[in-house]
Interface confidence: low
Protein backbone atom coordinates (compact mmCIF):
# COMPACT_ATOMS: atom_id res chain seq x y z
CA UNK A 1 0.00 0.00 0.00
CA UNK A 2 1.41 3.19 -1.02
CA UNK A 3 1.72 4.71 2.50
CA UNK A 4 2.87 1.85 4.56
CA UNK A 5 6.12 2.60 4.99
CA UNK A 6 8.20 2.44 8.09
CA UNK A 7 11.26 1.35 8.63
CA UNK A 8 13.98 3.03 7.15
CA UNK A 9 15.40 1.32 4.56
CA UNK A 10 16.89 -1.89 5.42
CA UNK A 11 18.68 -2.32 1.96
CA UNK A 12 21.05 1.13 2.38
CA UNK A 13 24.70 -0.22 3.84
CA UNK A 14 27.16 1.64 5.80
CA UNK A 15 30.25 1.77 3.66
CA UNK A 16 33.45 2.82 4.67
CA UNK A 17 34.44 6.07 2.71
CA UNK A 18 38.27 6.73 1.86
CA UNK A 19 39.28 9.24 -0.56
CA UNK A 20 38.97 12.76 -2.32
CA UNK A 21 35.21 12.43 -2.91
CA UNK A 22 35.17 11.51 1.09
CA UNK A 23 35.41 15.22 1.92
CA UNK A 24 35.70 14.93 5.47
CA UNK A 25 33.70 11.99 6.15
CA UNK A 26 35.13 8.51 6.76
CA UNK A 27 31.62 6.55 6.24
CA UNK A 28 28.79 6.60 3.95
CA UNK A 29 25.36 5.46 3.08
CA UNK A 30 24.59 3.90 -0.05
CA UNK A 31 23.22 0.65 -1.86
CA UNK A 32 26.49 -0.64 -2.53
CA UNK A 33 30.24 0.05 -1.36
CA UNK A 34 33.04 -0.39 -3.18
CA UNK A 35 37.16 -0.53 -3.08
CA UNK A 36 38.67 0.83 -6.00
CA UNK A 37 42.12 1.30 -7.45
CA UNK A 38 43.51 3.52 -10.69
CA UNK A 39 46.66 4.13 -12.30
CA UNK A 40 46.89 8.06 -11.96
CA UNK A 41 50.07 9.36 -13.57
CA UNK A 42 52.01 6.43 -12.53
CA UNK A 43 50.79 6.44 -8.44
CA UNK A 44 48.18 3.94 -7.15
CA UNK A 45 45.37 5.67 -6.09
CA UNK A 46 42.99 3.53 -3.89
CA UNK A 47 39.08 4.97 -2.93
CA UNK A 48 36.72 3.18 -1.19
CA UNK A 49 33.20 4.49 -1.17
CA UNK A 50 29.50 4.05 -1.71
CA UNK A 51 27.16 4.03 -4.89
CA UNK A 52 24.16 5.62 -3.26
CA UNK A 53 21.86 4.69 -6.35
CA UNK A 54 21.81 0.84 -7.23
CA UNK A 55 22.16 1.45 -10.97
CA UNK A 56 24.81 3.58 -10.45
CA UNK A 57 27.31 0.98 -9.09
CA UNK A 58 25.42 -2.06 -11.05
CA UNK A 59 26.99 -0.70 -14.31
CA UNK A 60 30.23 0.67 -12.42
CA UNK A 61 30.61 -2.86 -10.81
CA UNK A 62 30.57 -4.98 -14.03
CA UNK A 63 33.21 -3.32 -15.84
CA UNK A 64 35.79 -6.24 -16.06
CA UNK A 65 39.19 -5.08 -14.52
CA UNK A 66 41.97 -3.04 -17.09
CA UNK A 67 45.58 -2.78 -16.17
CA UNK A 68 44.62 0.66 -15.29
CA UNK A 69 41.59 0.06 -12.70
CA UNK A 70 39.64 -2.10 -10.95
CA UNK A 71 36.58 -2.22 -8.97
CA UNK A 72 35.10 -4.47 -6.19
CA UNK A 73 31.86 -4.06 -4.84
CA UNK A 74 30.09 -5.61 -1.82
CA UNK A 75 26.47 -5.24 -0.30
CA UNK A 76 26.57 -5.13 3.68
CA UNK A 77 27.75 -2.64 6.40
CA UNK A 78 31.27 -2.19 6.46
CA UNK A 79 31.57 -4.91 3.84
CA UNK A 80 34.33 -3.20 1.79
CA UNK A 81 36.68 -2.11 5.24
CA UNK A 82 39.11 -5.33 4.60
CA UNK A 83 38.58 -5.24 0.71
CA UNK A 84 41.43 -4.10 -1.28
CA UNK A 85 40.61 -3.95 -5.19
CA UNK A 86 43.68 -5.64 -7.19
CA UNK A 87 45.03 -4.67 -11.05
CA UNK A 88 44.99 -8.11 -12.96
CA UNK A 89 48.45 -9.40 -13.37
CA UNK A 90 49.58 -10.88 -17.06
CA UNK A 91 48.64 -14.00 -17.45
CA UNK A 92 46.51 -14.60 -14.92
CA UNK A 93 42.98 -14.86 -15.01
CA UNK A 94 41.31 -11.85 -12.67
CA UNK A 95 38.21 -13.00 -10.49
CA UNK A 96 34.47 -11.30 -11.74
CA UNK A 97 34.03 -7.88 -9.54
CA UNK A 98 31.23 -9.63 -7.73
CA UNK A 99 33.04 -11.63 -5.62
CA UNK A 100 30.99 -10.43 -3.11
CA UNK A 101 33.43 -11.48 0.42
CA UNK A 102 30.59 -13.91 1.54
CA UNK A 103 31.70 -13.71 4.79
CA UNK A 104 31.19 -10.11 5.07
CA UNK A 105 27.89 -9.71 3.38
CA UNK A 106 24.36 -9.94 3.66
CA UNK A 107 23.52 -10.10 -0.03
CA UNK A 108 20.21 -9.07 -1.59
CA UNK A 109 18.86 -12.12 -3.00
CA UNK A 110 17.81 -12.20 -6.90
CA UNK A 111 13.91 -11.51 -5.66
CA UNK A 112 14.73 -8.49 -3.88
CA UNK A 113 16.57 -7.13 -6.99
CA UNK A 114 13.26 -7.93 -9.09
CA UNK A 115 15.95 -9.89 -11.45
CA UNK A 116 17.97 -8.45 -13.98
CA UNK A 117 15.43 -7.16 -16.40
CA UNK A 118 13.30 -5.24 -13.93
CA UNK A 119 15.31 -1.36 -13.46
CA UNK A 120 15.22 -1.78 -9.31
CA UNK A 121 12.84 1.77 -8.17
CA UNK A 122 14.57 3.50 -5.45
CA UNK A 123 11.63 4.34 -3.62
CA UNK A 124 11.19 0.02 -3.64
CA UNK A 125 14.06 0.38 -1.42
CA UNK A 126 13.06 3.08 0.95
CA UNK A 127 10.27 1.20 3.08
CA UNK A 128 10.19 1.45 6.29
CA UNK A 129 9.40 -2.15 8.14
CA UNK A 130 5.39 -1.78 8.39
CA UNK A 131 3.33 -4.65 10.81
CA UNK B 1 29.69 13.24 2.43
CA UNK B 2 26.13 14.89 2.28
CA UNK B 3 25.98 18.13 3.67
CA UNK B 4 22.64 19.99 4.71
CA UNK B 5 22.24 23.65 4.89
CA UNK B 6 19.36 25.21 6.43
CA UNK B 7 17.12 28.46 6.27
CA UNK B 8 13.93 30.55 6.90
CA UNK B 9 12.32 32.92 9.49
CA UNK B 10 13.42 32.86 13.21
CA UNK B 11 11.02 35.20 14.36
CA UNK B 12 7.07 35.00 14.28
CA UNK B 13 3.97 36.02 16.01
CA UNK B 14 1.49 33.82 17.18
CA UNK B 15 -1.39 31.91 14.13
CA UNK B 16 1.54 33.26 11.34
CA UNK B 17 3.20 30.24 9.38
CA UNK B 18 6.90 28.96 9.66
CA UNK B 19 8.59 28.19 7.00
CA UNK B 20 12.34 26.70 6.35
CA UNK B 21 13.99 25.39 3.69
CA UNK B 22 16.92 22.40 3.66
CA UNK B 23 19.62 22.64 0.62
CA UNK B 24 21.20 18.92 -0.07
CA UNK B 25 25.33 18.75 -1.05
CA UNK B 26 27.40 16.07 -1.65
CA UNK B 27 24.04 13.22 -1.84
CA UNK B 28 22.28 11.25 -3.80
CA UNK B 29 18.70 13.05 -3.46
CA UNK B 30 17.33 9.47 -4.03
CA UNK B 31 19.25 7.74 -1.41
CA UNK B 32 17.94 9.32 1.70
CA UNK B 33 14.71 10.32 3.49
CA UNK B 34 14.33 13.94 3.95
CA UNK B 35 13.19 14.54 7.73
CA UNK B 36 12.39 17.55 10.37
CA UNK B 37 13.07 17.46 13.57
CA UNK B 38 12.55 19.77 16.32
CA UNK B 39 14.07 21.00 20.09
CA UNK B 40 12.08 23.26 22.30
CA UNK B 41 14.91 25.14 24.68
CA UNK B 42 16.17 22.69 27.41
CA UNK B 43 14.22 19.65 26.14
CA UNK B 44 13.84 16.83 23.78
CA UNK B 45 14.08 16.06 19.75
CA UNK B 46 10.60 15.41 18.17
CA UNK B 47 10.17 14.08 14.69
CA UNK B 48 7.73 16.35 12.14
CA UNK B 49 7.77 14.17 9.15
CA UNK B 50 9.46 12.96 6.27
CA UNK B 51 9.29 13.22 2.32
CA UNK B 52 11.21 11.44 0.04
CA UNK B 53 12.60 12.48 -3.80
CA UNK B 54 9.13 11.42 -5.55
CA UNK B 55 7.48 13.35 -2.92
CA UNK B 56 5.79 10.85 -0.48
CA UNK B 57 5.46 11.99 3.01
CA UNK B 58 4.77 10.28 6.45
CA UNK B 59 3.97 13.83 9.17
CA UNK B 60 3.36 13.29 12.80
CA UNK B 61 0.49 12.63 13.96
CA UNK B 62 0.64 14.78 16.96
CA UNK B 63 1.12 17.89 14.65
CA UNK B 64 -2.00 16.93 12.62
CA UNK B 65 -2.90 18.76 9.28
CA UNK B 66 -0.35 21.81 10.75
CA UNK B 67 2.68 20.47 8.96
CA UNK B 68 3.65 20.05 4.95
CA UNK B 69 6.65 18.88 4.17
CA UNK B 70 7.71 19.52 0.07
CA UNK B 71 10.32 18.86 -2.24
CA UNK B 72 11.86 20.38 -5.11
CA UNK B 73 14.37 18.26 -6.71
CA UNK B 74 15.93 20.02 -9.18
CA UNK B 75 17.17 22.39 -6.82
CA UNK B 76 17.47 19.30 -4.06
CA UNK B 77 16.16 21.15 -1.81
CA UNK B 78 13.10 20.26 0.71
CA UNK B 79 10.92 22.43 2.75
CA UNK B 80 8.56 22.73 6.30
CA UNK B 81 5.62 24.76 6.34
CA UNK B 82 4.11 24.84 10.00
CA UNK B 83 0.86 26.61 10.11
CA UNK B 84 -1.02 28.22 12.90
CA UNK B 85 2.00 29.16 15.12
CA UNK B 86 1.96 29.14 18.92
CA UNK B 87 4.34 29.70 21.37
CA UNK B 88 4.54 26.21 22.36
CA UNK B 89 6.53 26.08 18.46
CA UNK B 90 8.67 27.86 19.94
CA UNK B 91 12.27 25.34 19.27
CA UNK B 92 15.52 24.85 16.95
CA UNK B 93 14.74 23.04 13.65
CA UNK B 94 16.99 20.65 12.01
CA UNK B 95 16.67 18.89 8.09
CA UNK B 96 17.89 15.46 8.39
CA UNK B 97 18.87 13.03 5.80
CA UNK B 98 18.53 9.20 7.13
CA UNK B 99 17.56 5.30 6.07
CA UNK B 100 18.13 3.67 9.40
CA UNK B 101 18.94 6.17 11.16
CA UNK B 102 19.44 10.13 11.40
CA UNK B 103 23.16 10.46 10.13
CA UNK B 104 23.03 14.20 8.91
CA UNK B 105 21.96 17.13 10.25
CA UNK B 106 21.39 20.59 9.30
CA UNK B 107 23.15 22.98 11.44
CA UNK B 108 19.36 23.88 12.61
CA UNK B 109 17.15 27.50 13.21
CA UNK B 110 16.06 28.96 16.34
CA UNK B 111 12.40 29.57 15.78
CA UNK B 112 10.77 31.84 18.57
CA UNK B 113 7.18 32.79 18.50
CA UNK B 114 6.36 35.71 20.26
CA UNK B 115 3.91 38.30 20.31
CA UNK C 1 5.53 4.01 20.12
CA UNK C 2 6.58 6.03 23.34
CA UNK C 3 10.53 5.44 24.30
CA UNK C 4 11.48 5.63 27.88
CA UNK C 5 14.67 6.91 29.02
CA UNK C 6 16.50 6.63 32.82
CA UNK C 7 17.91 8.04 33.90
CA UNK C 8 17.53 11.74 33.25
CA UNK C 9 20.77 12.91 34.08
CA UNK C 10 23.65 11.63 36.09
CA UNK C 11 26.47 12.45 37.34
CA UNK C 12 29.94 10.48 37.74
CA UNK C 13 33.38 10.50 37.96
CA UNK C 14 35.85 10.34 34.80
CA UNK C 15 37.09 6.89 34.63
CA UNK C 16 33.71 5.35 35.70
CA UNK C 17 31.38 3.19 33.76
CA UNK C 18 28.08 4.87 32.85
CA UNK C 19 24.82 2.60 32.04
CA UNK C 20 21.57 4.84 30.29
CA UNK C 21 18.39 2.90 29.51
CA UNK C 22 16.08 3.39 27.19
CA UNK C 23 12.21 1.28 27.05
CA UNK C 24 10.25 1.13 25.00
CA UNK C 25 6.35 0.80 24.67
CA UNK C 26 6.19 -2.24 22.51
CA UNK C 27 8.60 -4.79 20.73
CA UNK C 28 10.31 -2.14 18.29
CA UNK C 29 12.42 -5.49 16.58
CA UNK C 30 15.59 -4.14 17.49
CA UNK C 31 15.23 -0.64 15.33
CA UNK C 32 17.03 1.23 17.75
CA UNK C 33 19.62 4.30 17.66
CA UNK C 34 21.87 6.21 19.84
CA UNK C 35 22.49 10.06 19.45
CA UNK C 36 24.87 12.09 21.23
CA UNK C 37 24.12 15.71 21.39
CA UNK C 38 26.67 18.50 22.86
CA UNK C 39 25.48 21.78 23.83
CA UNK C 40 25.33 24.03 21.27
CA UNK C 41 25.00 21.18 18.27
CA UNK C 42 23.08 19.25 16.04
CA UNK C 43 22.82 15.55 17.82
CA UNK C 44 25.04 12.82 16.27
CA UNK C 45 24.61 9.41 15.49
CA UNK C 46 26.80 7.09 17.69
CA UNK C 47 24.81 3.68 17.32
CA UNK C 48 22.29 2.14 14.94
CA UNK C 49 20.69 -0.92 15.36
CA UNK C 50 20.71 -1.36 18.85
CA UNK C 51 24.90 -2.20 19.24
CA UNK C 52 26.61 -0.98 16.07
CA UNK C 53 28.82 1.64 16.03
CA UNK C 54 30.11 4.19 13.48
CA UNK C 55 33.13 4.48 12.47
CA UNK C 56 35.02 7.15 13.92
CA UNK C 57 32.77 6.46 17.33
CA UNK C 58 35.40 5.48 20.26
CA UNK C 59 35.09 1.93 21.39
CA UNK C 60 34.15 3.30 25.01
CA UNK C 61 30.40 3.61 23.80
CA UNK C 62 28.40 0.27 23.26
CA UNK C 63 24.76 -0.84 23.17
CA UNK C 64 23.14 -3.64 24.24
CA UNK C 65 19.71 -5.28 24.65
CA UNK C 66 16.50 -6.58 22.53
CA UNK C 67 12.87 -6.58 22.15
CA UNK C 68 11.77 -3.49 24.41
CA UNK C 69 14.42 -3.15 26.96
CA UNK C 70 17.67 -1.67 25.79
CA UNK C 71 20.76 -0.03 27.16
CA UNK C 72 23.90 2.23 26.23
CA UNK C 73 26.93 2.26 28.40
CA UNK C 74 30.32 4.28 28.14
CA UNK C 75 32.36 1.87 29.60
CA UNK C 76 35.06 4.78 31.18
CA UNK C 77 33.48 7.90 31.21
CA UNK C 78 35.89 10.88 29.73
CA UNK C 79 35.24 14.87 29.88
CA UNK C 80 34.37 15.17 25.83
CA UNK C 81 31.57 12.52 26.72
CA UNK C 82 29.63 15.17 28.21
CA UNK C 83 26.55 15.89 26.31
CA UNK C 84 23.10 14.59 26.12
CA UNK C 85 22.63 11.40 24.99
CA UNK C 86 18.79 10.14 23.44
CA UNK C 87 17.68 6.70 22.36
CA UNK C 88 14.82 6.45 18.79
CA UNK C 89 13.43 3.84 17.56
CA UNK C 90 12.46 3.55 13.62
CA UNK C 91 10.17 -0.02 14.10
CA UNK C 92 7.08 2.20 12.85
CA UNK C 93 5.83 5.56 12.56
CA UNK C 94 6.18 8.25 13.90
CA UNK C 95 9.61 7.92 14.91
CA UNK C 96 10.00 8.94 18.41
CA UNK C 97 13.13 9.25 20.72
CA UNK C 98 13.20 8.80 24.26
CA UNK C 99 13.70 11.92 26.40
CA UNK C 100 16.99 12.13 26.54
CA UNK C 101 19.71 12.05 29.61
CA UNK C 102 22.00 14.28 30.84
CA UNK C 103 25.50 13.55 31.46
CA UNK C 104 27.72 15.53 33.98
CA UNK C 105 31.06 15.27 35.33
CA UNK C 106 31.06 15.15 39.42
CA UNK C 107 33.76 17.30 40.24
Known amino acids: MEDEKPKVNPKLYMCVCEGLSCGNEDHCEGQQCFSSLSINDGFHVYQKGCFQVYEQGKMTCKTPPSPGQAVECCQGDWCNRNITAQLPTKGKSFPGTQNFHLEEQKLISEEDLGGEQKLISEEDLHHHHHH | QVQLQQWGAGLLKPSETLSLTCAVY????????WSWIRQPPGKGLEWLGEINHRGRTNNNPSLASRVTISVDTSKSQFSLRLTSVTAADTATYYC?????????WGQGTRVTVSS | IQMTQSPSSLSASVGDRVTITCQAS??????LNWYQQKPGQAPNLLIY???NLLPGVPSRFSGSGSGTDFSFTISSLQPEDIATYYCQHYDDLPLTFGGGTTVAIRR
Open chain 3, 49 to 51: DVF
Open chain 2, 26 to 33: NGSFSSFY
Open chain 2, 96 to 104: TAHTRGFLY
Open chain 3, 26 to 31: QDINNY
